[in-house]
């Protein structure tokens, strides 16, 4: 799927826009906002009542490099007794992130983005009933 | 893909710090993965530390449309619907990648850029801080 | 320009630890993974992990695993590898080095530490 | 782990000469492979990535070719700096590996 383009009057005129080949993008990897951190409460992976373990995979031709997956840990919830309480469920919660993805063609090394759906926590929900007829 | 491949012992690249500019293959390498959380799954509602969401839009950015999770309560709710204010409801933020068009308005020229979102909401037990 | 320094050489008993430093400059730290190569004498290169900068996150190599730390500070441009309970085995140049964009392979070198491992 | 192993170990030869180093993949690596010159107390410099792109700065006599498990290093005509450790790299998965080095020997 390609980049959807806003509305053409928006944009500047052509000329002062960088010249781009046919069907690529120019993109500056030099990052926004790099120094901003995660501002989350301490170790909520283990002090949620749906907790959760974290897997790293590693690859050497995307970028970032390491993805960070959660995996819940248990099909309940841990209620009160810190007992796993299965009339209710521990679900992932996912995210959509891009990266770049290393190719090579010929000799020109070039990347393609690629959408990546991150799982970032788990939450604890009332399980859906199905009632049979 | 980007420049046209060369042949003999393809040649330099010109820059010292290649790459701070990469050219990108427009088309997007992705399983078609909803944008709309409210369409995938309605945990938000369902869950005991319910969230809402609020759509965050700018054009000059890609993805456009960014959903922010906000947690209804400060406690997390019980069987019987009430709030429990011995638990909390917490967010859980993730940093993703998203490309801003750089310079502005321009169509397919763009700058990586890290964001913090919002995805969602989890209940925990909270710090409890003792004072001497 | 892009320059990779190493800290000096260290001499070290054998079970003790040794932390090498590597300064940054020239480019943007954050954007950049920095490697940690080693080499022993007479032998050739060895991979021993890898750092990101920007989160710390780290990834070894099986046989470094649970003797070596590597750790980075954003505020002087900084990364360090420390090895613990060293043998003569860890004698060896250690390099860090810098990993090109999506990290595969390196492309700029620090100068190289010499760890001499005796008791 | 992917195993990378170079042949010949050692090579004599002359200023002039045409030399080409081979490396082999345990399992294919596409086109992820990167060669290094190392000489005695210096850093290893990197000649070419990705098989066969050149990295700025080197000179053309120096080229790589190949793709999946096998590689080679071709230096077209022998220079007096070229006699150094030639080091073959995987850079398709972690952990990172080299290869065993080729020492490139004045005759």
């Known amino acids: 799927r390609k980049i959807p383009k806003v509305g053409h009057t928006f944009f500047q005129k052509p000329e002062s826009c960088p010249p781009v080949p046919e069907g690529s993008m120019k993109l500056d990897t030099g990052i926004i906002n790099e120094n901003q951190r995660v501002s989350m409460s301490r170790n909520i992976e283990s002090r949620s009542t749906s907790p959760w373990n974290y897997t790293v995979t590693w690859d050497p031709n995307r970028y970032p490099s390491e993805v960070v997956q959660a995996q819940c840990k248990h099909l309940g919830c841990i209620n009160a007794q810190g007992k796993e309480d299965i009339s209710m469920n521990s679900v992932p919660i996912q995210q959509e992130t891009l990266v770049l993805r290393r190719k090579h063609q010929g000799c020109s090394v070039s990347f393609q983005l690629e959408k990546v759906l991150v799982t970032v926590g788990c939450t604890c929900v009332t399980p859906v009933v199905h009632h049979v007829q | 893909g980007i420049a046209i491949p060369r042949n003999s012992g393809c040649p330099n690249s010109e820059d010292k710090n290649f790459p701070r500019t990469v050219m990108v293959n427009l088309n997007i390498h992705n399983r078609n993965t909803s944008t709309n959380p409210k369409r995938s799954s309605d945990y938000y509602n369902r869950s005991t530390s319910p969230w809402n969401l609020h759509r965050n839009e700018d054009p000059e950015r890609y993805p456009s449309v960014i959903w922010e999770a906000k947690c209804r309560h400060l406690g997390c709710v019980k069987a019987d619907g009430n709030v429990d204010y011995h638990m909390n409801s917490v967010p859980i933020q993730q940093e993703i990648l998203v490309l801003r068009r750089e310079p502005r308005h321009c169509p397919n020229s763009f700058r990586l850029e890290k964001i913090l979102v919002s995805v969602g909401c989890t209940c925990v037990t909270p710090i409890v801080h003792h004072v001497a | 320009q892009v320059q990779l320094v190493q800290s000096g050489a260290e001499v070290k008993k054998p079970g003790a630890s040794v932390k090498v430093s590597c300064k940054a400059s020239g480019y943007t730290f954050t954007i950049y993974y920095l490697h940690w190569v080693r080499q022993a004498p007479g032998q050739g290169l060895e991979w021993m992990g890898i750092i990101n900068p920007s989160g710390g996150r780290t990834n070894y190599a099986q046989k470094f695993q649970g003797r070596v730390t590597m750790t980075r500070d954003p505020s002087t441009n900084t990364v360090y590898m420390e090895l613990s309970s060293l043998t003569s085995e860890d004698a060896a140049v250690y390099y860090c080095a810098r990993g090109e964009f999506s990290s595969g392979w390196l492309d700029y070198w620090g100068q190289g530490t010499t760890v001499t491992v005796s008791s | 782990d992917i195993q990378m192993t170079q042949s010949p170990s050692s090579v004599s030869a002359s200023v002039g000469d045409r030399v080409t180093i081979t490396c082999r993949a345990s399992?294919?690596?596409?086109?992820?492979l990167a060669w290094y010159q190392h000489k005695p107390g210096k850093a290893p410099k990197l000649l070419i990535y990705?098989?066969?792109s050149l990295q700025s700065g080197v000179p053309s006599r120096f080229s790589g070719s190949g793709s999946g498990t096998d590689f080679t290093l071709t230096i077209s005509s022998l220079q007096p700096e070229d006699f150094a450790t030639y080091y073959c790299?995987?850079?398709?998965?972690?952990?990172?590996?080299f290869g065993g080095g080729t020492k490139v020997e004045i005759k």
């Open positions: 990705a098989a066969s």
């Open positions: 790299q995987q850079a398709n998965s972690f952990p990172l590996t």
């Open positions: 399992q294919g690596i596409s086109s992820w």
